[in-house]
Amino acid sequence: AGVFELQIHSFGPGPGPGAPRSPCSARLPCRLFFRVCLKPGLSEEAAESPCALGAALSARGPVYTEQPGAPAPDLPLPDGLLQVPFRDAWPGTFSFIIETWREELGDQIGGPAWSLLARVAGRRRLAAGGPWARDIQRAGAWELRFSYRARCEPPAVGTACTRLCRPRSAPSRCGPGLRPCAPLEDECEAPLVCRAGCSPEHGFCEQPGECRCLEGWTGPLCTVPVSTSSCLSPRGPSSATTGCLVPGPGPCDGNPCANGGSCSETPRSFECTCPRGFYGLRCEVSGVTCADGPCFNGGLCVGGADPDSAYICHCPPGFQGSNCEKRVDRCSLQPCRNGGLCLDLGHALRCRCRAGFAGPRCEHDLDDCAGRACANGGTCVEGGGAHRCSCALGFGGRDCRERADPCAARPCAHGGRCYAHFSGLVCACAPGYMGARCEFPVHPDGASALPAAPPGLRPGDPQRYL
């Protein structure tokens, strides 16, 4: 475990003609902040691992207002470091993206507005515990100067933060084969469990389970002297003791390739294979153009005809990010309508529709009533992907095939008795009640709350519900 630290020194116009306009004005004061995104060395290609090593956001810088007529100076910066903690081993080679953001502080409706001013990216080799490394990167007409380092968090030490330190067991010195932990001289390296059988004299390990050989030794367990395994490919001075040629310094020793380039020997010299955004004999020249293919996942690069003009990436469906490096979960946008199941196939989006719906996004409601008949004079009603029958009086069920019992719901109030009738139901009311459902009490003086009963019907007679 450890922390990657980034110190921004300056952000302002780069050298040469075409100085950029100040990003802030009297009408629109603004302030800067920065974002850093880190990925392990090879993950630049991997869309599924955006900022896999971590990311950090700086504080906001001081508010800046452009002086009319003055060229854009170096802009005021936020205080402090950007710190990206990493939990596992430091990978040694890493990719970074540093973005400079502008926060406009004018009278924006709904709060401040943010816009990306510049973005730089690169790949570097860096050992943890080393000194600050300085860098200058250009993005269009802007120039960013910064330093960075990786440091281990105790008890971890080493170039990859994989060795552990423990307090000394004895006051004077560490145990056999264990070094003091610089800079924690009062602590000792904790022994690592190397690969089983790894030579204790000629091998060592920086991570559990590995076996790395000291100079002059080789083999999976560092038990084979280099002199016996190198006679087939002689190079360099002869060994006086074995009479065999021991490899001398090769053109790739010390890796002459900068910025994470990988070295391969050629008959005359060496050749560097440079990471994206770097070129030159030793990958020492920086500056990304569209011809470098900075857009991942087939993205279209626009602009960036030369190293001093910024490029933008137009991403294929399913990808986003400044370099199309992030895979989008397009199903999270719930594109399938009417309860359809979303399937993101990577190159396309598919919707598996529920019964009764169709179309690329399940947007078409199929004619649910087509070919469906409702019996006994019922009418078909569409909706929700399933047909429904509105049944004629006296019938029920899905297709109106069942004769309904109109008395099942106990429609007669106040103890009235219900009788099924060909045209509906009839309520025989209990004494003291009247009405189609026996809902009205009869007044004690014989008058009812209703208008006079129709001729031929006395209060208390069964009232037929028409």
């Epitope: 090879l42 293919g293 996942n297 279209l300 690069c301 137009h314 294929p316 190159h347 396309a348």
Partner: antibody
């Protein structure tokens, strides 16, 4: 300057085979998806297939009309992409273009394939 | 596969006139439509991407519009070098497909 140069076209009998090459210069070839697109005489454009990057395990995709007959490969060290065409049919007669990316930004000048008995 | 239908098949116009080309998709393709220009004996060249964005180096007289299923390429004032065949292509769904083309010829 970006240049894509196709070669390998020619006259071949139905059922025969042909291998097309596309050599790229002026770009970091290994960072680009590569496609083959064809155009039958007096007809429109038809995407044939695609090969992605080493980091994508050189994944390939093909149009249904050529699946099982055509194979795309690439040699990043030579900045070259290939189209191996087997079991050729008369309807494969076309000008074949190589093109880059998902959006076909850079195009070659094309090479003509004629399948005829 | 998504089908793109271009109209008209041929457009006869004079230099200086405005050209309006149409492209209809068989289903919603968002704004993932590009326009390509092809002159006789030459390879196609990307003009417009994302339905309305001009590609690097393309003159401002070319503009694109539309989203969903209906797209338009407009050449505001035809130059002699603009007489060519124009294709629309969709990149919403894999595989990419092209329209049949519109030939812009000199009247």
């Amino acid at each position: 300057e970006v240049q894509l140069v196709e070669s390998g076209g020619g006259l071949v009998k139905p059922g025969g085979s042909l291998r097309l090459s596309c050599a790229a210069s002026g770009i970091t070839f290994s960072n680009f998806w590569m496609n083959w697109v064809r155009q039958a005489p007096e007809k429109g454009l038809e995407w044939v297939g695609q090969i992605r990057l080493k980091s994508d395990q050189y994944a390939t995709h093909y149009a249904e009309s050529v699946k099982g007959r055509f194979t795309i490969s690439r040699e990043d060290s030579k900045n070259t992409v290939y189209l191996q065409m087997n079991s050729l049919k008369t309807e494969d007669t076309a000008v074949y273009y190589c093109t880059t990316g998902y959006y076909f930004d850079y195009w070659g000048q094309g090479t003509t394939v004629t399948v005829s008995s | 596969n998504i089908v793109l239908t271009q109209s008209p098949a041929t457009l006869s116009l004079s230099p200086g006139e405005r050209a309006t080309l149409s492209c209809k998709a068989s289903e919603n393709v968002g704004t993932y439509v590009s326009w390509f220009q092809q002159k006789p004996g030459q390879s196609p060249r990307l003009l417009i991407y994302g339905a309305s964005n001009r590609y690097t180096g393309i003159p401002a007289r070319f503009s694109g519009s539309g989203s969903g299923t209906d797209f338009t390429l407009t050449i505001s004032s035809l130059e002699p070098e603009d007489f060519a065949v124009y294709y629309c292509g969709q990149f919403y769904s894999f595989p990419s497909t092209f329209g049949g083309g519109t030939k812009v010829e000199i009247k």
